[in-house]
């Protein structure tokens, strides 16, 4: 099953199942872990392990939980207020240019270079030239809370965030 949320994943939940608690919106918004009813009168809880909402909202749906892809490990499960957190398996990393998939880390550095950084779930090994100390790596920024993405990551804003 695809881990990406598409329009088809977002059908409104017309009726609250017995386990779905209802409460009233506050200033027209429902709290994290809920979505608003079609008539706007109720907040309906998301279904644990199935969908979630992390922020105050007036959405007619909760968002489907991500299923970690093969090659990923689940760091934390989906709750009603937080999506699943997935991370690349040991020995693989998620590259900024292709953040939708985990890639194998290199096993060693090219000739004339030395390793100065290990393989991590978010970066390949880091190599520098023996003499100059110049970097040679596919380094990406630190892992954010969710290490998942749809194809492509913005070059502009993300490069600004430390």
């Amino acid at each position: 099953e695809s881990a990406l949320i598409t329009q088809q994943d977002l059908a409104p939940q017309q009726r609250a199942a017995p386990q779905q608690k209802r409460s009233s919106p506050s200033e027209g918004l429902c709290p994290p872990g809920h979505h608003i009813s079609e008539d706007g009168r109720d907040c309906i809880s998301c279904k644990y392990g199935q969908d979630y909402s992390t922020h105050w909202n007036d959405l007619l749906f909760c968002l489907r939980c991500t299923r970690c892809d093969s090659g990923e490990v689940e760091l934390s499960p989906c709750t009603t207020t937080r999506n699943t957190v997935c991370q690349c398996e040991e020995g693989t990393f998620r590259e900024e240019d292709s953040p939708e998939m985990c890639r194998k880390c290199r096993t060693g550095c090219p000739r004339g270079m030395v390793k100065v950084g290990d393989c991590t779930p978010w970066s390949d090994i880091e190599c520098v030239h023996k003499e100059s100390g110049t970097k040679h790596s596919g380094e990406v920024p630190a892992v954010e809370e969710t290490v998942t993405s749809s194809p492509g990551t913005p070059a502009s804003p993300c490069s600004l965030s430390g």
């Epitope: 695809s2 881990a3 990406l4 949320i5 598409t6 329009q7 977002l10 979505h35 608003i36 992390t54 922020h55 909202n57 007036d58 959405l59 007619l60 749906f61 968002l63 991500t66 999506n83 953040p99 954010e144 809370e145 969710t146 290490v147 998942t148 993405s149 749809s150 194809p151 492509g152 990551t153 913005p154 804003p157 993300c158 965030s161």
Partner: nanobody
Framework: EVQLLESGGGLVQPGGSLRLSCAAS????????MSWFRQAPGKGLEFVSY????????AYADSVKGRFTISRDNSKNTLYLQMNSLRAEDTAVYYC?????????????????WGQGTLVTVSS
């Protein structure tokens, strides 16, 4: 891929209002996931608000809840962020982001189209 262009930023006094626009070109936005993020000086990208182009409703960060509102104009292919009761801490570059599919709506990595950003300064 869709191209995004933000406008509407500027200098405003605390308590004032601004409306940011995000004009899309390249294709229709039907089914697109749309978000606003912001980046304060020296800080990382922060989620502000999320919605789906042709679906009612939106989600808002705690810091802007009750003050900011997302809206859309289909005829102009434009997403708006109405910002009221602005505070000094709202000072940031505001980015509009879009993607046909997302894994986590509040994660910048989930979006593949970004505008160049518009600067909002709240100061007296």
């Amino acid at each position: 891929e869709v191209q995004l262009l933000e406008s509407g930023g500027g200098l405003v006094q605390p308590g004032g209002s601004l409306r940011l626009s995000c004009a899309a070109s390249g294709r229709a936005l039907t089914g697109y996931h749309m978000s606003w993020f912001r980046q304060a000086p020296g800080k990382g990208l922060e989620f502000v608000s999320y919605g789906i182009w042709d679906r009612a409703g939106a989600a808002y960060a705690d810091s802007v809840k009750g003050r900011f509102t997302i809206s859309r104009d289909n005829s102009k292919n434009t997403l708006y962020l109405q910002m009221n009761s602005l505070r000094a801490e709202d000072t940031a570059v505001y980015y509009c982001a879009a993607s046909m599919a997302v894994r986590t709506y509040y994660s910048p990595r989930s979006y593949d189209s970004w505008g160049q950003g518009t600067l909002v300064t709240v100061s007296s």
